[in-house]
């Protein structure tokens, strides 16, 4: 069971990143699915290595003082959302903006029907060029 | 099937990074090989988690305006090269240069004879000290 | 065999990071253990994907000129410690400090009784908020 999906620019104002099965994507079988273009949902309980990579372009003067933060979040059936991983990068002083990449990854127990998704502080700063921003998992 | 190879400084002007089976490297068996010191080639079709880490030292004034970009690329038999993953970091203002690390990783389907390699915008900026820059894969 | 442990602030002056089985941690079975809150020790020989993520907050003026470096280290029975992976990030000019995240990961052969741990140049700069700093492994 494995998946690797590719970032998709979205007109939605939500902080949850959007993904698509496009380019050189992976969707090994129907035991993992991309739902509503925003979350990877697994049908089997077990340990999964889950990862995300986010490239963004921001400028210190044009952004809030808070850093750019990417969060990997989990929603299990009958449970509240929770944060699995976060990474933070302070905005660049480069103009018009400076690109930076964040990589998140870890091993987590997922229940049947559990979904994972990626949240960012400012989705408008995310880079969607080939290979820059992606999200995936693999069952151990 | 798994491999982990270590960066090697090169006098070549190519943007493709060079690697070696040295230090604490991994080469599980002959189903994965390091070819010409530049690419990992697999003999078996399947899903692989492929990763690279690149540490570099650059300075904004001494570098081009474009960021430092590391790309994980795929060459399948009878197919054109394609980019699987990219990460970008704007150059530091630290002098003489500021070190930064990039990590790339994702799950991809590889065909028999497929090769993966790592490209960077400026190989002269890459750090080759122990553990700083490495490249590997594992078959799921 | 898999583990994922969560960073713990420590009053110790050591450069070795401290970890805990708290929050959404993983400890698959007793073939991997967290020892003294500082190292993951495995009982079985084999290939492991080992990873660490460290988020830190530093300022160029308040820090030494040297970058912030995170190192993944190995101690095998009867052998000296060795560095498996390192990543470096130059300190930010943001005030009071600028957050940055480092991700390390690679495939390594571990012997029975081998331990892996994470070293940083300045543990006081490490961020311990939910999901920021973690450490884990999985057996292939």
């Amino acid at each position: 069971i494995a998946a690797h999906v590719i970032s998709e620019a979205s007109s939605k104002t939500t902080s949850v990143l959007q993904w698509a099965e496009k380019g050189y994507y992976t969707m090994s079988n129907n035991l993992v699915t991309l739902e509503n273009g925003k979350q990877l949902t697994v049908k089997r309980q077990g340990l999964y290595y889950i990862y995300a990579q986010v490239t963004f372009c921001s400028n210190r003067e044009a952004s809030s003082q808070a850093p750019f933060i990417a969060s990997l979040c989990l929603k299990s059936p009958g449970r509240f959302e929770r944060i699995l991983l976060r990474a933070a990068n302070t905005h660049s002083s480069a103009k018009p903006c400076g690109q930076q990449s964040i990589h998140l990854g870890g091993v987590f127990e997922l229940q049947p029907g559990a979904s994972v998704f990626v949240n960012v502080t400012d989705p408008s700063q995310v880079s969607h060029g080939t290979g820059f921003t992606s999200f995936g998992l693999l069952k151990l | 099937i798994a491999a982990h190879v270590i960066s090697e400084a090169s006098s070549k002007t190519t943007s493709v990074l060079q690697w070696a089976e040295k230090g604490y490297y991994t080469m599980s068996n002959n189903l994965v090989t390091l070819e010409n010191g530049k690419q990992l080639t697999v003999k078996r079709q399947g899903l692989y988690y492929i990763y690279a880490q690149v540490t570099f030292c650059s300075n904004r004034e001494a570098s081009s305006q474009a960021p430092f970009i590391a790309s994980l690329c795929l060459k399948s038999p009878g197919r054109f090269e394609r980019i699987l993953l990219r990460a970008a970091n704007t150059h530091s203002s630290a002098k003489p240069c500021g070190q930064q690390s990039i990590h790339l990783g994702g799950v991809f389907e590889l065909q028999p004879g497929a090769s993966v390699f790592v490209n960077v915008t400026d190989p002269s900026q890459v750090s080759h000290g122990t553990g700083f820059t490495s490249f590997g894969l594992l078959k799921l | 065999i898999a583990a994922h442990v969560i960073s713990e602030a420590s009053s110790k002056t050591t450069s070795v990071l401290q970890w805990a089985e708290k929050g959404y941690y993983t400890m698959s079975n007793n073939l991997v253990t967290l020892e003294n809150g500082k190292q993951l020790t495995v009982k079985r020989q084999g290939l492991y994907y080992i990873y660490a993520q460290v988020t830190f907050c530093s300022n160029r003026e308040a820090s030494s000129q040297a970058p912030f470096i995170a190192s993944l280290c190995l101690k095998s029975p009867g052998r000296f410690e060795r560095i498996l992976l390192r990543a470096a990030n130059t300190h930010s000019s943001a005030k009071p400090c600028g957050q940055q995240s480092i991700h390390l990961g690679g495939v390594f052969e571990l012997q029975p009784g081998a331990s892996v741990f994470v070293n940083v140049t300045d543990p006081s700069q490490v961020s311990h908020g939910t999901g920021f700093t973690s450490f884990g492994l999985l057996k292939l």
């Epitope: 449970r79 929770r82 976060r86 933070a88 502080t121 | - | 941690y25 961020s127 311990h128 908020g129 939910t130």
Partner: nanobody, 116 residues
Framework: EVQLLESGGGLVQPGGSLRLSCAAS????????MMWVRQAPGKGLEWVST????????YYADSVKGRFTIFRDNSKNTLYLQMNSLRAEDTAVYYC?????????WGQGTLVTVSS
């Protein structure tokens, strides 16, 4: 034993504001992400907002984004929810909650009624 005690609810007119508080005990508050959830009359539990242990990251349901603000004071072991521009559809019992490894904990709740 984990204890979460909410307060600050009441009757408020549409467009008004309220600040909810949650006093936590029985665990190391500063180690945990915390959240607010709510249950409208006759409906299921709905997640409202989450804040990380360090207070740096906050997350909101789309229905409250821009109107509600979650914050915490780790020195006082207290979680807050500032609710502005309240609407009739915000009427609910609000619960402070903590994620455990295997299940979630929440308090007794405080009732918020938005009505003219």
């Amino acid at each position: 034993e984990v204890q979460l005690l909410e307060s600050g609810g009441g009757l408020v007119q549409p467009g008004g504001s309220l600040r909810l508080s949650c006093a936590a005990s029985g665990f190391t508050f500063s180690d945990y992400e915390m959240m607010w959830v709510r249950q409208a009359p006759g409906k299921g539990l709905e997640w409202v907002s989450t804040i990380t242990s360090d207070g740096i990251s906050t997350y909101y349901a789309d229905s409250v984004k821009g109107r509600f603000t979650i914050f915490r004071d780790n020195s006082k072991n207290t979680l807050y929810l500032q609710m502005n521009s309240l609407r009739a559809e915000d009427t609910a019992v609000y619960y402070c909650a903590k994620s455990g490894r295997f299940f979630d904990y929440w308090g007794q709740g405080t009732l918020v009624t938005v009505s003219s």
